[in-house]
Amino acid sequence: MMTGTIETTGNISAEKGGSIILQCHLSSTTAQVTQVNWEQQDQLLAICNADLGWHISPSFKDRVAPGPGLGLTLQSLTVNDTGEYFCIYHTYPDGTYTGRIFLEVLESSVAEHGARFQIP
């Protein structure tokens, strides 16, 4: 029975050229976390494995940094980084928990004027 819930940073925005931390937190379960995958759509960005630690996909090595914690830091953001990001917690015995974050990367001038992305 899956009793856990994933809390995420939700819908966030960041400035082009800047960096952002993607964070998820699994709560309300005693399940053992064996691995956390970070994905953008269906592309694997990074893995944090209980035995091996972090593995960053080669195509993202220059712009993705592990942590803090089980989170992920995206650097040198571009407008193309706008989109959905998923944290996938592989746990035992519960199974797979997935959290969703929507990131909008704003042009610097827009960001300076305090625009924030919101889903109605």
């Epitope: 899956m2 893995i47 494995n49 209980a50 035995d51 091996l52 593995h55 035992y92």
Partner: antibody
Framework: EVQLVESGGGLVQPGGSLRLSCAAS????????MHWVRQAPGKGLEWVAF????????YYADTVKGRFTISRDNAKNSLYLQMNSLRAEDTAVYYC????????????WGQGTMVTVSS | DIQMTQSPSSLSASVGDRVTITCRAS??????LAWYQQKPGKAPKLLIY???TLQSGVPSRFSGSGSGTDFTLTISSLQPEDFATYYC?????????FGGGTKVEIK
């Protein structure tokens, strides 16, 4: 080239024991979780056990829990399945299989070793 | 445990045919379904994982779709080497469970 070669199968009496081995080559064995999966003659596939890359996570199917023990020796690139208190229903081809690095499915399998439990 | 039900259990088809196999999970497994091909006396071979992602080296005539409880494996144009048994398997939670298999035979 990724290779997984099982050995140790054979004929054993009910209540007996057997130790299966799986020799891995062609990849960094210590980076991958590993599974045992079995297939009874003429039947479908049944997952048996899993061990993570560093042995911190070990899971078993209910049908073998308490009787089978999965282990690994990363220095020897080897996976093992110690099978005790064997029953007729354990008769099957036993496959070792590698877990994908992303934890999604089993991407390479050995050729299998046959275990027959009969008196 | 999650029960995986495959249909049909067997089918007859000709080279060039479009073949569809379905797999239903007893509860939602999100996208976490794999498809394997097995030929007599051989080990299973991974075709598709996470519902629709083609394993490296697998021909593009194989495709997977679905999420939640209902999934489909499609072979767009059946080739002689595709006659085999196909298994679905959920990789959402332990114990990992397989469908009963679908045998694809020559008509």
């Amino acid at each position: 080239e990724v290779q997984l070669v099982e050995s140790g199968g054979g004929l054993v009496q009910p209540g007996g024991s057997l130790r299966l081995s799986c020799a891995a080559s062609g990849f960094t064995f210590s980076n991958f979780g590993m599974h045992w999966v079995r297939q009874a003659p003429g039947k479908g596939l049944e997952w048996v056990a899993f061990i993570s890359s560093g042995s911190s996570s070990i899971y078993y199917a209910d049908t073998v829990k308490g009787r089978f023990t999965i282990s690994r020796d990363n220095a020897k690139n080897s996976l093992y399945l110690q099978m005790n208190s064997l029953r007729a229903e354990d008769t099957a081809v036993y496959y070792c299989a590698r877990m994908r690095l992303d934890y999604y499915a089993m991407d390479y399998w050995g050729q299998g070793t046959m275990v027959t439990v009969s008196s | 445990d999650i029960q995986m039900t495959q249909s049909p259990s067997s089918l007859s088809a000709s080279v060039g045919d479009r073949v569809t196999i379905t797999c239903r999970a007893s509860k939602s497994i999100s996208k976490y379904l794999a498809w394997y091909q097995q030929k007599p006396g051989k080990a299973p071979k991974l075709l598709i994982y996470s519902g629709s992602t083609l394993q490296s080296g697998v021909p593009s005539r194989f495709s997977g779709s679905g999420s939640g409880t209902d999934f489909t494996l499609t072979i767009s144009s059946l080739q002689p080497e595709d006659f085999a048994t196909y298994y679905c398997q959920q990789h959402n939670e332990y114990p990992w469970t397989f469908g009963g298999g679908t045998k694809v035979e020559i008509k």
